[in-house]
């Protein structure tokens, strides 16, 4: 759902842990579209709370209100807690905003598990650590909600980033960064660089922590380090993608592509775990255990669902494998690989751990939607969305989280024959965009 | 069936070290599906985990006692041992050995308990 | 630490009775949740795990419900043999190192 395994996500410190950061290689990828460099204003716009999302802070309406939003790349509406609710400490007054306008239409948007409700209108909206605009806006006043917002998260709304074709109630609903760029010379590229705390931090360390970056309409070069690896946007929808192999440890899972990108493959900020088909997530389990099997975890860690707990500062990072996910590249029967270390998925839950633990949850999950690329992948990661040039880029991400052994990586080229079959073709109905639940 | 069965001194001075065994009959220890623990309840009080191991060596321990706690394994006798040292009359117990299952999460399968008194 | 909280402490009933013992988390706890039995002189024995899943073996006039924080134990009708300590044990957070002080069942 959008909560649960969908939203949660975890916060964390920015900067490169333990003072490790790799040394710059040449850039070689061609000219990116819009500013290069430096965007000083938007570093460090994000925070967020541990499986809680991480949200931008934006203001809507004249005068301007503060609201602090969600950001996901996983959907595709800008949607703003509208009335009272016992988890919200603020929430969009419209009455009290001289520039909106009602579009005298509702939205209903139910998941798995949970759903929201509102009325569309319009409204000025900017993101103060953002560029330097103001744009009119599509906004969803919700109204009614069901295990939408969480306790303690912080955020009121949610930035859906994704494309027109998943906006409800349907694709005429033009989303925010369609109008940001419509409206203003803003470039049609966005960046995203979600820092995991790598440890448990409790509410108030939560809340003053940086998360990350949203560098709106271009790339900061002091968020990555390496070269940027780019992968073809299959279907501008959601921000879907190719996988063509999967590793655990250097260990090809060998399964046929199809299986990794059934029914889809996705890069979805909305989302804290890598969540992975059916098929897919048992051999991966069933690989990361051997790799692991001088230890034996409890089934409902596999699960998700039961912590692992050990004496702070001992967690045995070097019996869990890396996970490497080779993305289809740009140039005909060329791949490059993303890998992650545990570090990134193995979640620290701060609820239970005390000065005395470290207590983890298993962050990789079954999917009945396809491969989603949440937090457990952008964690590790400089995100790159390249709408002008329908494209994604990944490079290691100056803040993910390591140790002195291992370091996430993005490498290649490789060469991967007959990758477009690894694409999986959606039958064509009417419903088969409809479950927006993502549990 | 598969029993446990607890052996080891009943009387340990202080400051000494408490060594018990636990052997495992009717079914092996070296089975994945399972970690072996042990368990300890102070006369009139509730249950303290110490600790458990699994076949390949692995273990786990209680926070409070990990200083002077060693679990070990031993899969040719089907037997596994625990060693508290730097005794105290608050070491007095009766220790349980217990099979850990259901998922390795629940204590299944007991021994029937040896009563430990540490006195000079 | 999650901290599991027992009560009432003593529970005394007559035998044919109705029995309920409750388990309280310090937080959530999911289902990950057992009950153990024990009688005097003798081991702990597994009554209830999963929350609500029978171990094998144990009658079923026991039953466990609850999920979250609060948890309870059920003997729908308590027979001679059921005067005993009832303990708690939560492993969501694992290794399970964690109980509950335990409840006391004593004829009235």
């Known amino acids: 759902t959008h909560l649960g395994i969908r939203l949660p996500l975890r916060s964390g410190l920015a900067g490169p842990p333990l003072g490790l950061r790799l040394p710059r290689e040449t850039d070689e990828e061609s000219e990116e579209p819009g500013r290069r460099g430096s965007f000083v204003e938007m570093v460090d716009n994000l925070r967020g709370k541990s499986g809680q999302g991480y949200y931008v802070e934006m203001t809507v309406g004249s005068p301007p209100q503060t609201l602090n939003i969600l950001v996901d790349t996983g959907s595709s509406n800008f949607a703003v807690g509208a009335a009272p609710h016992p988890f919200l400490h603020r929430y969009y007054q419209r009455q009290l905003s001289s520039t909106y306008r009602d579009l005298r239409k509702g939205v209903y948007v139910p998941y798995t598990q949970g759903k929201w409700e509102g009325e569309l209108g319009t409204d000025l909206v900017s993101i103060p650590h953002g560029p330097n605009v103001t744009v009119r806006a599509n906004i969803a006043a919700i109204t009614e909600s069901d295990k939408f917002f969480i306790n303690g998260s912080n955020w009121e709304g949610i930035l859906g980033l994704a494309y027109a074709e998943i906006a409800r109630p349907d694709d005429s609903l033009e989303p925010f960064f369609d109008s940001l760029v419509k409206q203003t010379h803003i470039p049609n590229i966005f960046s995203l660089q979600l820092c995991g705390a790598g440890f448990p931090l409790n509410q108030t360390e939560a809340l003053a922590s940086v998360g990350g970056s949203m560098i709106i309409g271009g790339i900061d070069h002091s968020l990555y380090t390496g070269r940027l690896w780019y992968t073809p946007i299959r279907r501008e929808w959601y921000y879907e993608v190719i996988i063509v192999r999967v590793e655990i440890n250097g260990q090809d899972l060998k399964m046929d592509c199809k299986e990794y990108n059934y029914d889809k493959s996705i890069v979805d900020s909305g989302t804290t775990n890598l969540r992975l088909p059916k098929k897919v997530f048992e051999a991966a389990v069933k690989s990361i255990k051997a790799a692991s099997s001088t230890e034996k975890f409890p089934d409902g860690f596999w699960l998700g669902e039961q912590l692992v707990c050990w004496q702070a500062g001992t967690t045995p990072w070097n019996i869990f494998p890396v996970i490497s996910l080779y993305l289809m590249g740009e140039v005909t029967n060329q791949s490059f690989r993303i890998t992650i270390l545990p570090q990134q998925y193995l979640r620290p839950v701060e609820d239970v751990a005390t000065s005395q633990d470290d207590c983890y949850k298993f962050a990789v999950s079954q999917s009945s939607t396809g491969t989603v690329m949440g937090a457990v992948i952008m964690e590790g990661f400089y995100v790159v969305f390249d709408r002008a040039r329908k494209r994604i880029g990944f490079a290691v991400s100056a803040c993910h989280v390591h140790d002195e052994f291992r370091t996430a990586a993005v490498e290649g080229p490789f060469v991967t024959a007959d990758m477009e079959d690894c694409g999986y073709n959606i039958p064509q109905t009417d419903e088969s965009t409809l479950m927006t639940g993502r549990a | 069936q598969l029993q446990l069965q607890e052996s080891g001194p009943g009387l340990v001075k202080p400051s000494e070290t408490l060594s018990l065994t636990c052997t495992v009959s009717g079914g092996s220890i070296s089975s994945s599906s399972y970690y072996w623990g042990w368990i300890r309840q102070p006369p009139g009080k509730g249950l303290e985990w110490i600790g458990m191991i699994y076949y390949s060596g692995s273990t786990w321990y209680n926070p409070s006692l990990k200083s002077r706690v060693t679990i070990s394994v031993d899969t040719s006798k089907n037997q596994f041992s625990l060693k508290l040292s730097s005794v105290t009359a608050a070491d007095t117990a009766v220790y349980y050995c217990?099979?850990?299952?259901?998922?390795?999460?629940?204590?299944?399968?007991w021994g029937r308990g040896t009563l430990v008194t540490v006195s000079s | 630490e999650i901290v599991l909280t027992q009560s009432p402490a003593t529970l005394s009933l007559s035998p044919g009775e109705r029995a309920t013992l409750s388990c309280r988390a310090s937080q959530s706890v999911s289902s990950y949740l057992a009950w153990y039995q024990q009688k005097p002189g003798q081991a702990p024995r597994l009554l209830i795990y999963d929350a609500s899943k029978r171990a094998t073996g144990i009658p079923a006039r026991f039953s466990g419900s609850g999920s979250g924080t609060d948890f309870t134990l059920t003997i729908s009708s308590l027979e001679p043999e059921d005067f005993a300590v009832y303990y708690c044990q939560q492993v969501y957070t694992w290794p399970p190192r964690t109980f509950g002080g335990g409840t006391k069942v004593e004829i009235k």
């Open positions: 217990a099979r850990v299952g259901h998922g390795i999460s629940y204590f299944d399968l």
